[in-house]
Interface confidence: low
């Protein structure tokens, strides 16, 4: 028996369902009684889901997995993972045994889009050219860790005094806080771009300082 999986990682959004594709070519006269199908975590060998002795043995992994029982006889051994979480990320091995056996691994990459950044300015009043200001760009609930870029009104990179911190919450999603310390010009726009490297999703925030008032 030969097992085939997709070579590219499966990308799944947090809280959506993902299908980890795995297939084999059954011989003529193949019966499900002959099939032993095991899905496991590649690294830890933890059992995820199994089909043995002619029946679906069910999920052994947080009760969020399912096979496609009607398609098994055609050689479709794909696994459905429901309500994907950050901790589901990793490599899954599909192990198929009929008379002989074969296995292959498929990678699951979890992602979550970052929220539109909120911008704060400190100090936020009585600003004059030459003042040192702190601009904070905050974006929430993304995964994996973001790339953060600062640009001026002309779209040129601001590489000055930037400090970026990324903190994971209980669900493993990241909250990003990037702080730019800059000396004000006569007026200007300061833009923050938070990029999700997996989704290639860009979230933009900007603050424009034109004397008074500021616009966000």
């Amino acid at each position: 028996v030969e097992v085939q999986v997709s070579e590219d990682p499966v990308v799944a959004l947090v809280d959506t369902d993902a299908t980890l594709r795995c297939s084999f070519s059954p011989e003529p006269g193949f019966s499900l009684r002959q099939l032993n199908l095991i899905w496991q975590l590649t690294d830890t060998k933890q059992l995820v889901h199994s089909f043995t002795e002619g029946r679906d043995q069910g999920s052994a992994y947080a009760n969020r997995t399912a096979l496609f029982p009607d398609l098994l006889v055609q050689g479709n051994a794909s696994l459905r993972l429901q309500r994907v979480r950050v901790t589901d990320e990793g490599s899954y091995t599909c192990f198929v045994s009929i008379q002989d056996f074969d296995s292959a691994a498929v990678s699951l990459q979890v992602a979550a889009p970052y929220s539109k950044p909120s911008m704060t300015l400190e100090p936020n009043k009585d600003l004059r050219p030459g003042d040192m200001v702190t601009i904070t760009c905050s974006s929430y609930q993304g995964y994996p860790e973001a790339e953060v870029f600062w640009k001026d009104g002309q779209g040129l990179p601001l590489t000055g005094n930037v400090t970026t911190s990324q903190m994971a919450n209980e669900r493993g999603l990241f909250d990003v806080h990037s702080v730019l310390r800059v000396v004000l010009g006569a007026n200007g726009t300061y833009s923050c771009l938070v990029r999700n490297p997996v989704l290639q999703q860009d979230a933009h925030g900007s603050v424009t300082i034109t004397g008074q008032p500021m616009t966000f």
Epitope: T44, A62, T87, A168
Partner: antibody, heavy 121, light 107 residues
């Protein structure tokens, strides 16, 4: 069934550090979170922080930020809690706790037996 | 941080009594609340999660209710084994916080 076994009681001097271990068995260590909760004599429960080994990420309660470090060694299924700059009010029983699988990061089905740390000069 | 306030701090009751313990959150935590029982010298034991879901193996005389900021743990008929301390815990946001505890003692 998850089992959590902690290291033994210790007496420490003020200003020193202590490192408590918590060895897990009976589950998939890397995919669940280990929290540390302490209880001063005759007092209530206080959550200090947690580590999620599969992510390699630790979160701490603000009160302990800078003084506590929680780590995990996946190869030995052991979590560690190190508390520095000890003072007398850190005298407490320290528990490691977890929810048994990756879906229970927030409530605690399983607890270690507790480690009494006494801080005294 | 979300403050959890339990009342009463001590409760005297007899075997067979119906006992109610209240837990109040300083802000809404939806139903992200757990209840624990702790006996002297022992680690806590999870009784209720998600405000009203009974943990496997916990006797049905224990029940939880409430959402938002007001929650209750009820023991329908107090048994000798139930004399202990009880704690609520919110898990809506970091840091996880516990109530101050309620000691249920023999009247």
């Amino acid at each position: 069934q998850v089992q959590l076994v902690e290291s033994g009681a210790e007496v420490k001097k003020p200003g020193s550090s202590v490192k408590v271990s918590c060895k897990a068995s009976g589950g998939t260590f890397s995919s669940y979170a280990i929290s540390w909760v302490r209880q001063a004599p005759g007092q209530g429960l206080e959550w200090m922080g947690r580590i999620i080994p599969i992510l390699g990420i630790a979160n701490y309660a603000q009160k302990f930020q800078g003084r506590v470090t929680i780590t995990a060694d996946k190869s030995t299924s052991t979590a560690y809690m190190e508390l520095s700059s000890l003072r007398s009010e850190d005298t407490a029983v320290y528990y490691c706790a977890n929810g048994g699988d990756s879906s229970s990061w927030y409530t605690f089905d399983y607890w270690g037996q507790g480690t009494l740390i006494t801080v005294s000069s | 941080d979300i403050q959890m306030t339990q009342s009463p701090s001590t409760l005297s009751a007899s075997v067979g009594d119906r006992v109610t313990i209240t837990c109040r959150a300083s802000q809404s935590i939806d139903n992200w609340l757990a209840w624990y029982q702790q006996k002297p010298g022992k680690a806590p034991k999870l009784l209720i999660y998600k405000a009203s879901s009974l943990q496997s193996g916990v006797p049905s005389r224990f029940s939880g209710s409430g959402s938002g900021t007001e929650f209750t743990l009820t023991i329908s008929s107090l048994q000798p084994d139930d004399f202990a301390s009880y704690y609520c815990q919110q898990y809506d946001s970091n840091p996880l916080t516990f109530g101050g505890g309620t000691k249920v003692e023999i009247k």
